[in-house]
Interface confidence: low
């Protein structure tokens, strides 16, 4: 199989004019640009405070970026007749701080959703499943892009941000068909334990530029379709045997580990041995030690067991102050 682009990016856009008349089904909403040939509507940087009600039925690609939407209520895109062709929805940078349950209901063809760069103080557990049933109807989503959706500290709810996002990803097992998930730049300290088990179709997972310290409690075992795992720019110190074995067991995966503060002591021995023989890690020759000080900037692939020692732990009576 081969890939190609099927939509025309050079199709003319029709800027709409505000009208007192009720909208026709394929009329362009005020403050938007529309191209029926490209099946695209762009309502970009217009300070919109709500989703236009009069979107044309032909819309396949909808850009609502750079607005001031604040809240996405249930049924925000529900129309009669429904927007049956809407496949790609970009809401990035629209000052959303609340996405409620069922916000994306009645979009039967929605394959790609981008909520990046919105400070989501509240993401409903049912934002993507649309229902509080233990098993919901499958979502059509294939690509979910949630980069930099962490709110400022003063806007966070009491519960953990990681837990809030995880609850939305696993609710009703609705996202079992998801192929791509981007969660970069969200200050994640950990990945909730059961999230990946509910996303068995993932091919591409981006967790870069977070604050992940450890993957000890994360299981990649069932992600048999995973092709790209991005863990760059986190706070990882070492990968332990269980994680190494799981990654090695994934048939198609490529793992990206650059710019983590690797601690090159005796606990690193297994990872170094694995790195020397694995083909899984991309750019493995670029990985360097950050700690201890004497090992800083040493290349992991060039280390041997004699380099990887741990200071003995002295009994309290022998410790010096």
């Amino acid at each position: 199989t081969s890939s190609a682009s099927s939509s025309s990016s050079s199709a003319p856009f029709l800027a709409s004019a505000a009208s007192a008349q009720p909208p026709l089904p394929d009329q362009c909403p005020a403050l938007c640009e529309c191209s029926e040939a490209a099946r695209t509507v762009k309502c970009v940087n217009r300070n919109l405070t709500e989703v236009p009600t009069d979107l044309p039925l032909y819309v396949r690609n909808l850009f609502l970026t750079g607005n001031q939407l604040a809240v996405l209520p249930a049924g925000a895109f529900a129309r009669r007749p429904p927007l049956a062709e809407l496949a790609a929805l970009n809401l990035s940078g629209s000052r959303l701080d609340e996405v409620r349950g069922g916000a994306f209901e009645h979009l039967p063809s929605l394959r790609q959703l981008d909520l990046s760069h919105n400070p989501l103080a509240y993401l409903s557990p049912f934002a993507f499943s649309g229902s509080n049933a233990s098993i919901s109807a499958p979502s059509p989503l294939v690509e979910l892009i949630l980069n930099h959706i962490v709110p400022p500290d003063d806007k966070r709810q009491n519960r953990s941000f990681e837990g809030m996002v995880a609850a939305a990803l696993v609710a009703g097992r609705a996202l079992q068909g998801l192929h791509l998930l981007e969660l970069a730049s969200n200050h994640f300290l950990y990945l909730p334990r059961d999230v990946l088990a509910q996303l068995p179709s993932l091919r591409y997972l981006d967790l870069s530029n977070n604050s992940l310290v450890s993957l000890t409690y994360v299981s990649f075992r069932n992600l048999t379709h995973l092709e790209s795992l991005h863990l760059e720019d986190n706070a990882l110190k070492v990968l332990h045997n269980g994680t190494l074995a799981e990654l090695q067991g994934l048939p198609h995966v490529r793992v990206f580990l650059d710019n983590n503060p690797w601690v090159c002591d005796c606990h690193m021995a297994d990872m170094v041995t694995w790195l020397k023989q694995t083909g899984v890690v991309q750019g493995k020759d670029r990985l360097t030690c950050a700690f201890p000080e004497k090992m800083r900037n040493r290349v992991l692939l060039e280390l041997n067991s004699a380099d990887l020692d741990c200071d003995p732990i002295l009994p309290p009576s022998l410790q010096t102050s």
Epitope: T1, S2, S3, A4, S5, S6, S7, A84, E85, A87, A88, P108, S109, R111, Q112, P138, P140, V142, E143, I145, G177, H179, L180, S201, R203, Y204, E227
Partner: nanobody
Framework: EVQLVESGGGLVQPGGSLRLSCAAS????????MSWYRQAPGKGLELVAS????????RYADSVKGRFTISRDNAKNTLYLQMNSLRAEDTAVYYC?????????????WGQGTLVTVSS
């Protein structure tokens, strides 16, 4: 591995009919909109018809409206194109297309095509 295999093409006289099929595998067929495209000799790719996930909404090129019907059977993972009242200008290679996502993964898949020749 995603695979799309078209069949049903061939030589037909003007005014005749053909039914093209596209057997899909390697992805959850029922979750994706599907399309038929065609490419006539020396011409560009033209969208012929598309159908949404459950088959509730279809669209057609003006040149085939009223003559062609797109349908799908999600239970059989198969897309169809019923072509009636065929004309010489319908001669082309017809391609099945699954738009699985335009973003990072090159997930816009095509079959190998099936040739339809309309000639007396």
């Amino acid at each position: 591995e995603v695979q799309l295999v078209e069949s049903g093409g061939g030589l037909v006289q003007p005014g005749g009919s053909l039914r093209l099929s596209c057997a899909a595998s390697g992805f959850t067929f029922s979750s994706y909109a599907m399309s038929w495209y065609r490419q006539a000799p020396g011409k560009g790719l033209e969208l012929v018809a598309s159908i949404t996930t459950a088959g509730g909404s279809t669209r057609y090129a003006d040149s085939v409206k009223g003559r062609f019907t797109i349908s799908r059977d999600n239970a059989k993972n198969t897309l169809y194109l019923q072509m009636n009242s065929l004309r010489a200008e319908d001669t082309a290679v017809y391609y099945c297309n699954a738009e699985l996502g335009p973003r990072r993964l090159g997930m816009d898949y095509w079959g190998q095509g099936t040739l339809v020749t309309v000639s007396s």
